[in-house]
């Protein structure tokens, strides 16, 4: 029987620009962690595997880094990051646990107050 | 276009060590993890370990953890596999294997090295 | 280390044959299976990963499927240039670790 949950960030937000750190917790069981899958929809972003270490999507290399733990770390980010993220913990003996985080990327606040004041 | 193109043919004495060479190109070296997996004669494929080129970290099968050693040169973008105390065991193709987009496999191999190892 | 049987371990077949290979693993490997066609004097290709997504360039004859334990490798009308060994691997722990092979020639 499954009767771990998984805790995450919740609905976070960023600066244009900055970095975020994606973050899951497997708690409430026993079971060992064995990989755990980070993808953005659809989209492998990382894999962090007990045995083998890390594997980052080479589409995302130039701006993922692993960590910290489990984690993951998003950088440069540009607007087009905001949406859902997933990370899927493999198990054993349990199986697989699901998390989910929403992150929205704002534009920085100098960008704002230097738009609001554009000369036409 | 994807190429990785490995050192020549390597006769080696039992107790030596062996270092072949990968050049990769055709992508960006840095952003793809690389293989290396032997093939004895006749036999069927066994995974050594994989290097991260980027930060040079390693992982090894416990079973050459002891004798075998990957690297990377990146200005060349050419990743290397030494493998030391060899024994008649150890006689078998060498292949370097890019590792894929999506995980631990491999979508890329090189045309492999043979070392044979004979006193 | 996760063990992989393959079946058959060879099998003789005709051009234009529907041929199943199977992949057997010691444990849930998840849909961490690749598959690699090999052709004597060659290097290993790959032809599918995460079990059933098709490698680019690859006919789309080829097909797999399976998860957990078990998968299987189809080969939906055998053409001149599928006559080779073919591997399975999982992609899930260390070490990673390759079936045994299974030889398809002609009938």
């Known amino acids: 029987m499954m009767t771990g949950t998984i805790e995450t960030t919740g609905n976070i937000s960023a600066e244009k620009g900055g970095s975020i750190i994606l973050q899951c917790h497997l708690s409430s069981t026993t079971a060992q962690v064995t990989q755990v899958n980070w993808e953005q929809q659809d989209q492998l972003l990382a894999i962090c595997n007990a045995d083998l270490g890390w594997h980052i999507s080479p589409s995302f290399k130039d701006r993922v880094a692993p960590g910290p733990g489990l984690g993951l770390t998003l950088q440069s980010l540009t607007v087009n990051d905001t949406g859902e993220y997933f990370c899927i913990y493999h198990t054993y003996p349990d199986g697989t646990y699901t998390g989910r985080i929403f992150l929205e990327v704002l534009e920085s606040s100098v960008a704002e107050h230097g738009a609001r004041f554009q000369i036409p | 276009e994807v190429q990785l193109v490995q050192s020549g043919a390597e006769v080696k004495k039992p107790g030596a060590s062996v270092k072949v060479s990968c050049k990769a190109s055709g992508y960006t070296f840095t952003n793809y993890y690389m293989h290396w997996v032997r093939q004895a004669p006749g036999q069927g494929l066994e995974w050594m370990g994989r290097?991260?080129?980027?930060?040079?970290?390693?992982k090894y099968n416990e079973k050459f953890k002891s004798r075998v050693t990957i690297t990377v040169d990146k200005l060349s973008s050419t990743a290397y596999m030494e493998l030391s105390s060899l024994r008649s065991e150890d006689t078998a193709v060498y292949y370097c294997a890019r590792e894929g987009h999506y995980g631990f496999y491999s979508d890329y191999w090189g045309q492999g090295t043979t070392v044979t190892v004979s006193s | 280390d996760i063990q992989m049987t393959q079946s058959p371990s060879s099998l003789s077949a005709s051009v234009g044959d529907r041929v199943t290979i199977t992949c057997r693993v010691s444990?849930?490997?998840?849909?961490?299976l690749a598959w690699y066609q090999q052709k004597p004097g060659k290097s290993p290709k790959l032809l599918i990963y995460n079990a059933k997504t098709l490698a680019e360039g690859v006919p789309s004859r080829f097909s797999g499927s399976g998860s957990g334990t078990d998968f299987t490798l189809t080969i939906s009308s055998l053409q001149p240039e599928d006559f080779a060994t073919y591997y399975c691997?999982?992609?899930?722990?260390?070490?990673?670790?390759f079936g045994p092979g299974t030889k398809v020639d002609i009938k």
């Open positions: 444990e849930n490997i998840y849909s961490y």
């Open positions: 290097i991260d080129p980027d930060s040079g970290g390693s």
């Open positions: 691997q999982h992609h899930y722990g260390n070490p990673l670790t």
